[in-house]
Structure formats: structure tokens, C-alpha cells
């Protein structure tokens, strides 16, 4: 039969950051190839990564169609050299992925501090809004566009001369904080979705940016 000596995929795993979404699986193929199908709960399966020898498949284009839907992918195993028109009616071995809801499960990418500006004893810190591959009306949406007020940023800031950290939070991409006049401060931000109750509710911290370097601007008033 057309599927003898093929091994079903296993360890199907979703890897997703800011909606860029890859399905990975095992094993590395020996004399077999894979085709991936993905579907929402409608059961209308769409094939991707046809007869690939890779053990990953980029499914971003499918999941960004509706990031609030729940998706399932399945990986079919075929003998190497398989041609679809061979006429075998036997269903090849396949394995299902875990269910995946992008809006709830995509990891938050490491944010970046775009700029900071000091005016007297106030500093305005701006977080760069990351672009995603999610579209609306043929326009790519930013992370803020997609998550709206579900997404907050936490700012950690401290005097360059000490280690005691303070925090501030915003549900926009800007912070306005009070600082001591004449002191240099360092900043790091973290993206957070407070409504999530899982390990992926927070991003990693941004790179640290400190006053007195080119990213910021200081105006004493």
C-alpha cells in the first residue's frame, strides 16, 4: 500500500511570537515526506507545506485570518517520492497538533524602547509599536492594533547610580514619569497581557536604554 513504512509525526509543537506562527514536529524524515493541514473548528482543512522534507511549517498566513479562532493542524506522512495521482485511497498516517488560539497563546516578542525625552523633572518614554502580519482591510496591524487595551507595558526605571528599581504601567505605548533633576536614569520595558493566566502573559524585558546615550533627548527647563 502507499503508506507502508511511513511513521506518524509526533511532538507537534506551536512556536508563535507576535503571531508569526510555525508548527514544528518530529521525526526528521527518512524516506518520507510530510504535508500539513490546518483548520478552524469548521473542519475545512487547508493543505500547506506539500510533501516537504522539513519538520516545520509556517502557518502564519492561515492563523492571521482570524487570530481569535482556535486552530488545529495535522501532519500527514507519505513515502518519499509520493505522487498524489498514484490512486491510493488509504489515508496516510497523521497526527494532530494541540489546539492553538493565537490571540491567547502567541508569545509577546521582546519590546524595544523607541525614544525617551526629558523635560525638566518629567521623562516621556515611548515603546516602539511592533508590526504583525495580521491584516485588516489590506493593512498590516501593529501589536497595539490587535490587542488594544488587553496589552499593557510595564516600565522599569532606576537611577544609573543605584540599583533600586521603580515601575510604571501604561495601556498605551507611552509613559510619563517623574525623575530627580540632574540624575541619569536607565529604562527597560516589558509587554504584558494581564488577562492571560499562563506563562506567556509577559514578554522578555527590552534591552536597557540609559539617559545620556543617543536614543534619548534631554531638555532642562
Amino acid at each position: 500500500s502507499g503508506t507502508t513504512n511511513t511513521v506518524a509525526a509526533y511532538n507537534l509543537t506551536w512556536k508563535s511570537t507576535n503571531f508569526k506562527t510555525i508548527l514544528e514536529w518530529e521525526p526528521k524524515p527518512i524516506n518520507q515526506v510530510y504535508t500539513v493541514q490546518i483548520s478552524t473548528k469548521s473542519g475545512d482543512w487547508k493543505s500547506k507545506c506539500f510533501y516537504t522534507a522539513d519538520t516545520e511549517c509556517d502557518l502564519t498566513d492561515e492563523i492571521v485570518k482570524d487570530v481569535k479562532q482556535t486552530y488545529l493542524a495535522r501532519v500527514f506522512s507519505y513515502p518519499a517520492g509520493h505522487v498524489e495521482s498514484t490512486g491510493s485511497t488509504e489515508e496516510p498516517p497523521y497526527e494532530n497538533s494541540p489546539e492553538f488560539t493565537p490571540y491567547l497563546e502567541t508569545n509577546l516578542g521582546q519590546p524595544t524602547i523607541q525614544s525617551f525625552e526629558q523635560v525638566g523633572t518629567k521623562v516621556n518614554v515611548t515603546v516602539q509599536d511592533e508590526w504583525t502580519l495580521v491584516r485588516r482591510n489590506d493593512t498590516f496591524l501593529s501589536l497595539r492594533d490587535v490587542f488594544g487595551k488587553d496589552l499593557i507595558y510595564t516600565l522599569y526605571y532606576w537611577k544609573s547610580s543605584s540599583s533600586g528599581k521603580k515601575t510604571a504601567k501604561t495601556n498605551t505605548n507611552e509613559f510619563l514619569i517623574d525623575v530627580d533633576k540632574g540624575e541619569n536614569y536607565c529604562f527597560s520595558v516589558q509587554a504584558v497581557i494581564p488577562s492571560r493566566r499562563t506563562a506567556n502573559r509577559k514578554s522578555t524585558d527590552s534591552p536597557v536604554e540609559c539617559m545620556g546615550h543617543e536614543k534619548g533627548e534631554s531638555r532642562e527647563i
Epitope: 478552524t40 473548528k41 469548521s42 473542519g43 475545512d44 482543512w45 488545529l72 489515508e91 497526527e95 494541540p98
Partner: antibody, heavy 118, light 107 residues
Framework: EVQLLESGGGLVQPGGSLRLSCAAS????????MSWVRQAPGKGLEWVSS????????YYTDSVKGRFTISRDNSKNTLYLQMNSLRAEDTAVYYC???????????WGQGTLVTVSS | EIVLTQSPGTLSLSPGERATLSCRAS???????LAWYQQKPGQAPRLLIY???SRATGIPDRFSGSGSGTDFTLTISRLEPEDFAVYYC????????FGGGTKVEIK
């Protein structure tokens, strides 16, 4: 709240036809595969047929292939089962169920009784 | 076709006791593809467990599913009066088939 309401059951003679309907509400109908499951009096559950959200993919248990046709009208939020060439062994309560991916059955109607007898 | 065999056919227990229901498949079923249902007389079935171990929405945590390959188990940690019913397993790895059911009755 998800609600599924079957109708169209009744008494029919062997060889006859019947069309079951299932009116769905409380969810986006086209986003889900749907299924029919039956239960003969005093017996266990038997899957009959499933259909994808678009209606493009249909599946049947061997015993009803060629006799039963599953379909859906997403504009009316309604699932159908056209049953032809009915046999005595088709006598059962027929349940409509919401069926994510066509795999498991997460919401059920209360069922409609089909009796095939002369 | 994968055949599912449930045992025991009938389980006689008292409220507060632990119930262990077995479902055995004629060939290996990926654990992603097994579900459990509860059915009371005159009512439609209700989904309890899918994916062998994931509880459906609104199902109390006294219900748990486990197993892989050909052997699966539904456990009710402490039977409540409303838990006395018939329980069915169902696989969806190859077509859809149900087990014959286990009746949990009051002792």
C-alpha cells in the same frame, strides 16, 4: 448559550424518506463542523454523518452511504439530514451535535425520534 | 474501523465512592482523539472530556480522563448523586466510533 433543536422525525414505512432539520443558535454556525448521531431504542450511540462548516466536506458511516445526505444552510443556521430508502434498523433517536473539526461533539440537541415500520 | 470496548458494563457504587471506567481500543488511538460523554435517561449525551484528558467547559474537576494508545480511563473521584448515568467513550482518529457504554448505578 448554544442551542440545537431537531425536527422532522416521525413514523415512516420501510423504503420511505424523511428529512431531519436542526436549527442552531447561540454560536457562529458556519464556524463549526456539525454531525448527526443516532441511538436505537435501548442501545448505544452511533455516529451517522458529519459536515464541515462550509459544507464542502461530508462524511458518512458505511451503513448509510448512498442513502443519507447531510447538508447545511449557513444563511439559515440549519443542518439537514435527508434519509432515503429507510430500513427498520434506522429506527432511532437522531441527535444533531456541534462537532469541532468533525472530531468530538461538544453540544447536542435533544433529539428527534425516527421510526421505520410497516 | 477502530472498535472500542468499555468495561465494566455496569458499575454499582455508592455516593462518595471513586468510579473508574475503562475504554479499550482494538488498535492504537492517538490520545488527541478520545472523548468521554455522560448520558442520563431521556436526555442527550453531554461532553465531559476530549483529547483524552481535557475537561469540557463547565465540567466539575471530579471528572478526569487519562490514558494513551489502546487503554483509556475516566475517573470520577467522588460520586455525586447526579453522576449516576451511562458513560460512553468515543474515538475520532479514524472515522468516529463509540464504545458500548458503562452504566454507573447506585449500589
Amino acid at each position: 448559550e448554544v442551542q440545537l433543536l431537531e425536527s422532522g422525525g416521525g413514523l415512516v414505512q420501510p423504503g420511505g424518506s424523511l428529512r431531519l432539520s436542526c436549527a442552531a443558535s447561540g454560536f457562529t454556525f458556519s464556524n463549526y463542523a456539525m454531525s448527526w448521531v443516532r441511538q436505537a431504542p435501548g442501545k448505544g450511540l452511533e455516529w451517522v454523518s458529519s459536515i464541515s462548516g462550509s459544507g464542502d466536506y461530508t462524511y458518512y458511516t458505511d451503513s448509510v452511504k448512498g442513502r443519507f445526505t447531510i447538508s447545511r444552510d449557513n444563511s439559515k443556521n440549519t443542518l439537514y439530514l435527508q434519509m432515503n430508502s429507510l430500513r427498520a434498523e434506522d429506527t432511532a433517536v437522531y441527535y444533531c451535535a456541534r462537532s469541532p473539526w468533525g472530531y468530538y461533539l461538544d453540544s447536542w440537541g435533544q433529539g428527534t425520534l425516527v421510526t421505520v415500520s410497516s | 474501523e477502530i472498535v472500542l470496548t468499555q468495561s465494566p458494563g455496569t458499575l454499582s457504587l455508592s455516593p462518595g465512592e471513586r468510579a473508574t471506567l475503562s475504554c479499550r481500543a482494538s488498535q492504537s488511538v492517538s490520545s488527541s482523539y478520545l472523548a468521554w460523554y455522560q448520558q442520563k435517561p431521556g436526555q442527550a449525551p453531554r461532553l465531559l472530556i476530549y483529547g483524552a484528558s481535557s475537561r469540557a467547559t463547565g465540567i466539575p474537576d471530579r471528572f478526569s480522563g487519562s490514558g494513551s494508545g489502546t487503554d483509556f480511563t475516566l475517573t470520577i473521584s467522588r460520586l455525586e448523586p447526579e453522576d449516576f448515568a451511562v458513560y460512553y467513550c468515543q474515538q475520532y482518529g479514524s472515522s468516529l466510533t463509540f464504545g458500548g457504554g458503562t452504566k454507573v448505578e447506585i449500589k
